[in-house]
Interface confidence: low
């Protein structure tokens, strides 16, 4: 598998992985102790034709060309959990791997 | 995890799983032996706000806002493979289970 | 009521740009496509493109895609149409309409609420 | 690009009349079509929609039928305000495609 990495100063318009700092406290998000922020990244760009197509799927779809059918997107493709800390719903203080939280990698699906 | 789905008839615009019948013969797919068509389904509407939002991390870009991210997609979140029976390009017939060529669900990611 | 009021209208040289801009009010901006449509003097009615001002993505007409670039601001509740490399064809009054979806499937949607139009004039 | 032919261009009529407009696709498009109606230095109007469904507020004199490739904008009796440019779109794929318009005219 493989996935594009941009930041802001990238000249490419196809499905790339940006930096994205995501931060609680700007959110006003105070039931998270830690951490404050983390680096989450996103995705974006375009996906033409066949760029970045993780599944055989997403060309078949294409092909077929089904009404109301958008085309593929830019979307994580592979992503992974970081660790947190915060108050659950009863106050009380919970450590844990909460999933999906970091883009590893972006394509077209 | 949860996903919508939806027919033509349906009165459904938001990220839905719609039906979808691939006919490979009719691609001129003539290197695949079997099946000649298969049951590939696909994902098609709107993503609004928190609907069918897969990870916490679409919510938190979307918070974020940065420039470029063109909001959560509906795509889909889950798929599965089927057997196939086709040439490789050797002209060797092969079996094999071919990954994420059907899709089960679909979420806004 | 739902409106969506536009710009004034615009006299431009050839070969400059024109952004033409559509302010929504009435509704919920965000929730629904906005598609613009152009009408040369006389002639029929062509389909440009649309935007999602959820998300900023766009579908435009093939013959534009070169020149156009549809934006929305979410703040204002305004979409803006802008045209680039203008000609003397260009010349034609520019429509947004909203699009409205009634539900009965993706392509289940019809135009309910129209701008009053903004007349551009190409001319050297 | 999907073409719609409508016909005809141009159509003069009575008060009182019923006439029909007829929109012709390049190919199939289900019921994705609307119907227009558009006045001298006015913006567009839907009238109908998904080939057969009344907009909310026009009169039950409108009526569209039609599926596939073949649809037809109908007004069963013309009064003096019907007189006007009507546009039948496809709305089945992008880019969406207007026919080319008919000109209703008082006879």
């Known amino acids: 598998d493989f996935g594009l990495d941009c930041d802001e100063h990238s000249t490419e318009s196809r499905c790339c992985r940006y930096p994205l700092t995501v931060d609680f406290e700007a959110f006003g998000w105070d039931w998270i102790i830690a951490p404050k922020r983390y680096k989450a990244n996103y995705c974006s760009g375009e996906c033409e034709f066949v760029f970045l197509q993780k599944y055989p799927h997403t060309h078949l779809v294409h092909q077929a060309n089904p009404r109301g059918s958008a085309g593929p997107c830019c979307t994580p493709t592979k992503m992974s959990p970081i660790n947190m800390l915060y108050f659950n719903g009863k106050e009380q203080i919970i450590y844990g791997k909460i999933p999906a939280m970091v883009v590893d990698r972006c394509g077209c699906s | 995890d949860f996903g919508l789905d939806c027919d033509e008839h349906s009165t459904e615009s938001r990220c839905c799983r719609y039906p979808l019948t691939v006919d490979f013969e009719a691609f001129g797919w003539d290197w695949i032996i079997a099946p000649k068509r298969y049951k590939a389904n696909y994902c098609s509407g709107e993503c609004e706000f928190v609907f069918l939002q897969k990870y916490p991390h679409t919510h938190l870009v979307h918070q974020a806002n940065p420039r470029g991210s063109a909001g959560p997609c509906c795509t889909p979140t889950k798929m599965s493979p089927i057997n196939m029976l086709y040439f490789n390009g050797k002209e060797q017939i092969i079996y094999g289970k071919i990954p994420a060529m059907v899709v089960d669900r679909c979420g806004c990611s | 009521q739902v409106q969506l009021v536009q710009s004034g209208a615009e006299v431009k040289k050839p070969g400059a740009s024109v952004k033409v801009s559509c302010k929504a009010s009435?509704?919920?901006?965000?929730?629904?496509?906005m598609h613009w449509v152009r009408q040369a003097p006389g002639q029929g009615l062509e389909w440009m493109g649309n935007?999602?001002?959820?998300?900023?993505?766009?579908n435009y007409n093939q013959r534009f895609k070169a020149r156009v670039t549809m934006t929305t601001d979410t703040s204002t509740s305004t979409a803006y149409m802008e045209l680039r490399s203008l000609r003397s064809d260009d010349t034609a009054v520019y429509y947004c309409?909203?699009?409205?979806?009634?539900?009965?499937?993706?392509?289940?949607?019809?135009?309910?609420?129209w701008g009053q139009g903004t007349l551009v004039t190409v001319s050297s | 690009d999907i073409q719609m032919t409508q016909s005809p261009s141009s159509l003069s009529a009575s008060v009182g009349d019923r006439v029909t407009i007829t929109c012709k696709a390049s190919q199939d498009i289900n019921s994705y079509l609307s119907w227009f109606q558009q006045k001298p230095g006015k913006a567009p109007k839907s009238l109908i929609y998904?080939?057969?469904r009344l907009v909310d507020g026009v009169p039950s004199k409108f009526s569209g039928s039609g599926s596939g490739t073949d649809f037809t904008l109908t007004i069963s009796s013309l009064q003096p305000e019907d007189f006007a440019t009507y546009y039948c779109?496809?709305?089945?794929?992008?880019?969406?495609?207007f026919g080319a318009g008919t000109k209703l005219e008082i006879k």
């Open positions: 009435g509704y919920s901006f965000t929730g629904y496509f």
């Open positions: 998904r080939a057969n």
């Open positions: 779109l496809q709305c089945d794929e992008f880019p969406l495609t």
């Open positions: 309409a909203r699009r409205y979806y009634y539900g009965t499937g993706p392509a289940d949607w019809y135009f309910d609420v």
């Open positions: 935007i999602y001002p959820y998300n900023g993505v766009s």
